[in-house]
Amino acid sequence: CKAMHVAQPAVVLASSRGIASFVCEYASPGKATEVRVTVLRQADSQVTEVCAATYMMGNELTFLDDSICTGTSSGNQVNLTIQGLRAMDTGLYICKVELMYPPPYYLGIGNGTQIYVIDPEPCPDSDF
């Protein structure tokens, strides 16, 4: 028996508007009805929780109102979008998936997605 497998892309480049999207896919060993997805950021030996959501299979993924994350789920796949990113937010973003119900509980952690964020150059002043 091994840990539940979680797959995510190795690298994602955020858009010029500071938005990054990636898919987190997990190989469910059972038929979970309640799943918790957490996005963690590891950078400079620090680990922080970016956002988390618990959802019922077949229902919408709901993050807190003030969360920088949004997402949708389809089967064992979660499509995650992180907004408001700046260059200082560059780091390894790890998808953590927990199958909460019914028992048994399972935990899976992806190998992380390196998100690169480049702050846009300010627009030059125009004479017009």
């Epitope: 091994k2 030996s45 790890i94 953590k96 509980y105 935990l107 899976g108 190998n111 992380g112």
Partner: nanobody, 127 residues
């Protein structure tokens, strides 16, 4: 799936010793980092120590006093606690995390990466 059961808590005098055990069933411990954590009343859960196949890590507050070890043949994790102090009083938890290539000495014990939490065992250091 992994199931963890801990034992070994209790009341001990300052300067005394205790050994906590965490037995795993349903899986070998080999692909996991196993950690000890503790939570004192009114405080956040904090890392005590963790161990994987090749590395151990300790919180600064317990270095030199606590020793973590694992016996893969018994599928059991141990925490030997010596020179106990009043500030070590807390509920102690065992938890597991899949061992990942990006874990560093500084992050492999981070509680965010863990699951399979035990119910906790009370350790009280008092005279």
């Amino acid at each position: 799936e992994v199931q963890l059961v801990e034992s070994g808590g209790g009341l001990v005098q300052p300067g005394g010793s205790l050994r906590l055990s965490c037995a795993a069933s349903g899986s070998t411990l080999d692909p996991f980092v196993i950690g000890w954590f503790r939570q004192a009343p009114g405080k956040e859960r904090e890392t005590v120590s963790c161990i994987n196949r090749s590395r151990t890590s300790y919180a600064d507050s317990v270095k030199g006093r606590f020793t973590i070890s694992r016996d893969n043949s018994k599928n059991t994790l141990y925490l030997q606690m010596n020179s106990l102090r009043a500030e070590d009083t807390a509920v102690y938890y065992c938890a597991a995390s899949p061992d990942k290539p990006f874990y560093t000495d500084q992050t492999m014990c981070n509680k965010h990466y863990y699951g399979y939490w035990t119910q906790g065992t009370q350790v009280t250091v008092s005279s």
